[in-house]
């Protein structure tokens, strides 16, 4: 058993039918010595008396808010949560496996630049009685500070018969060094509590591996005289790290016909302009990627040819 | 050329070669991003590689103030990786494919290090750790880790030279 926060405790259980469970001793936080009784949740049934209460925790019915009283007055509370371990595997019932970029990916994170700011998100089908708390650090043995905000519900989607809820959190490395080569990964730890079930999820990454620039901005077409060619120009996204002479991007320019089956013409360039042939009803799209490190491409910025 | 005393390197040549190094490092092991090598416990393997750290002056301001600190650190790293790529980690079993870009990568590391430090000038170089994996699968894993680490190193070096070529070239 360990303390998650004040008056909230997590009992780790080997989880199988008829498992013996864990013996837990609760102590009433009071100078009083006698006349103390204990109850669980809203029930008025007295579970025991005395300053300590010994219970065998086996199932969710044994978890909950234990309260010690004296003469009708509440003295203190202890909330017991369960963390299930089945066959050596901690339960992951609360969050959905996003399966990208690999199986058992519960947390996904992205950064728009090298400033040390990043966003993580996760999915669940649970709509109520759900709380998250997020901690992060750079490295684990001698951790350096990363500050995370509160996790918030950022999207709701319908997937078949189920509703899916997306939560996200923003974090900022306290002393970020954008130009340095990272040697210690960022660690992100999410505590999830659904009713009386506790679970924890972790992710470990370098900022360089989760970089995904915003799409190029101010995408414009300039027709070239007496030609089907156009000059496409764009700018670095505002959110990208500066100076651009140091934090450089490379770009992919694509001409795509109306039909998805039509052949796509692609040009790669380090410049912020390119000359392409604009076909009727086609659109021109540009996306960006770090020039020197193959992290994710941005989403496309697009304009119609006509 | 970067003389330890302080004259400027051939920024544009260094920029071109470092950008080529980036391309080669990713073509040598493009799928490395899909392997979570940190799960494989790399404490003893890639902890000793020289990283370009915050105080090494490789940020735009540091380069403007005095690029020598940063260039020395980059030079150290280039020599270190050049030695690693020439060691039995890469020459031993399982053999690299004949068209593997590792050979080109090795030569380009040497080329860039020579651009930074002509013969007769000596910067301190870092000791290469004695890594001699016994099993072929351990050697393969170590190659992945070294190339992964090299990708990050050359990305910073390429940024330095690109910025230098754009802002510090005479």
């Amino acid at each position: 058993i360990w303390e998650l926060k004040k008056d909230v405790y997590v009992v780790e259980l080997d989880w199988y039918p008829d498992a013996p469970g864990e013996m837990v001793v609760l102590t009433c936080d009071t100078p009083e010595e006698d006349g103390i009784t204990w109850t669980l949740d809203q029930s008025s049934e007295v579970l025991g008396s005395g300053k300590t209460l010994t219970i065998q925790v086996k199932e969710f019915g044994d978890a909950g808010q234990y309260t010690c009283h004296k003469g009708g007055e509440v003295l203190s509370h202890s909330l017991l949560l369960l963390h299930k371990k089945e066959d050596g595997i901690w339960s992951t019932d609360i969050l959905k496996d996003q399966k990208e970029p690999k199986n058992k990916t519960f947390l996904r994170c992205e950064a728009k630049n090298y400033s040390g700011r990043f966003t993580c998100w996760w999915l669940t089908t649970i709509s109520t009685d759900l709380t998250f708390s997020v901690k992060s650090s750079r490295g684990s043995s001698d951790p350096q500070g990363v500050t995370c905000g509160a996790a918030t519900l950022s999207a709701e989607r319908v997937r078949g018969d189920n509703k899916e809820y997306e939560y996200s959190v923003e974090c900022q490395e306290d002393s970020a060094c954008p130009a340095a080569e990272e040697s210690l990964p960022i660690e992100v730890m999410v505590d999830a509590v659904h009713k009386l079930k506790y679970e924890n999820y972790t992710s470990s990454f370098f900022i360089r591996d989760i970089i995904k620039p915003d799409p190029p901005k101010n995408l414009q077409l300039k027709p070239l005289k007496n030609s089907r060619q156009v000059e496409v120009s764009w700018e670095y996204p505002d959110t990208w790290s500066t100076p651009h002479s140091y934090f450089s991007l490379t770009f992919c320019v694509q001409v795509q016909g109306k039909s998805k089956r039509e052949k796509k013409d692609r040009v790669f360039t380090d410049k912020t302009s390119a000359t392409v042939i604009c076909r009727k009803n086609a659109s021109i799209s540009v996306r960006a990627q770090d020039r020197y490190y193959s992290s994710s491409w941005s989403e496309w910025a697009s304009v119609p040819c006509s | 050329r970067a003389v330890p005393g302080g004259s400027s390197p051939a920024w544009t040549q260094c920029q071109q070669l470092s950008q080529k190094l980036c391309t080669l490092a990713w073509s040598a092991h493009p799928l490395v991003g899909h392997m979570d090598l940190r799960e494989e416990g790399d404490e003893e393997t890639t902890n000793d590689v020289p990283h370009i750290q915050c105080g090494d002056g490789c940020d735009p301001q540091g380069l403007r103030d005095n690029s020598q600190f940063c260039l020395q650190r980059i030079h150290q790293g280039l020599i270190f990786y050049e030695k690693l790529l020439g060691s039995d980690i890469f020459t031993g079993e399982p053999s690299l494919l004949p068209d593997s870009p590792v050979g080109q990568l090795h030569a380009s590391l040497l080329g860039l290090s020579q651009l930074l430090q002509p013969e007769g000038h000596h910067w301190e170089t870092q000791q290469i750790p004695s890594l001699s994996p016994s099993q072929p699968w351990q050697r393969l894993l170590l190659r992945f880790k070294i190339l992964r680490s090299l990708q990050a190193f050359v990305a910073v070096a390429a940024r330095v030279f690109a910025h230098g070529a754009a802002t510090l070239s005479p």
Epitope: W15, Y16, P17, E86, D87, G88, I89, S91, D93, D97 | -
Partner: antibody, heavy 116, light 108 residues
Framework: EVQLLESGGGLVQPGGSLRLSCAAS????????MSWVRQAPGKGLEWVSS????????DYADSVKGRFTISRDNSKNTLYLQMNSLRAEDTAVYYC?????????WGQGTLVTVSS | DIQMTQSPGTLSLSPGERATVSCRAS???????LAWYQQKPGLAPRLLIY???NRATGIPDRFSGSGSGTDFTLTITRLEPEDFAVYYC?????????FGPGTKVDIK
Amino acid sequence: EVQLLESGGGLVQPGGSLRLSCAASGFTFSNYSMSWVRQAPGKGLEWVSSIRSSGGRTDYADSVKGRFTISRDNSKNTLYLQMNSLRAEDTAVYYCATGIAVARYWGQGTLVTVSS
Amino acid sequence: DIQMTQSPGTLSLSPGERATVSCRASQSVSSSYLAWYQQKPGLAPRLLIYDASNRATGIPDRFSGSGSGTDFTLTITRLEPEDFAVYYCQQYSTSPFTFGPGTKVDIK
């Protein structure tokens, strides 16, 4: 007392389908992961598939991936194994068991014979 | 996948004797996630040991498990008549969870 009772086995032609069921009692079924393990006649044990308590995560042996689907109905305390594109080598006694991998409680098994 | 091998294939012993069954994994079994099962003809298997050395509920103390990494052992200190059966080891550190081929302990 924990009890697991498999049903749905029988003779099926190669390429055919079969759906096995496992009725659970004596424990809070919806709180626990469940598995299927099989045993070919005169041979050893082979783990086939597992499903977590909520049904949100499933795992399969390579030999059945893409052909077999494990599922559960917590309201009926029942575990299922839908077997499609059956092959002769799928002939075995199929056991349902509690747990992701460590089978602490087992059913008595149901025999599946794949033959033309 | 982790391959499991067991030795010997058959062990012929008399009641009261000590039985030692070995199980070897093709790669390290993390956290000693290894189980042992007993199976008698016509019956479902029964869990004996989990986490390499923990006895399952109701298993007599003559059964013990040991080992870590790639090498594991099941020991029955004094064979009782009801102990003559087939014994399987199983790793559950990595999916797919694989069983050994079994060791038959029969009466000499």
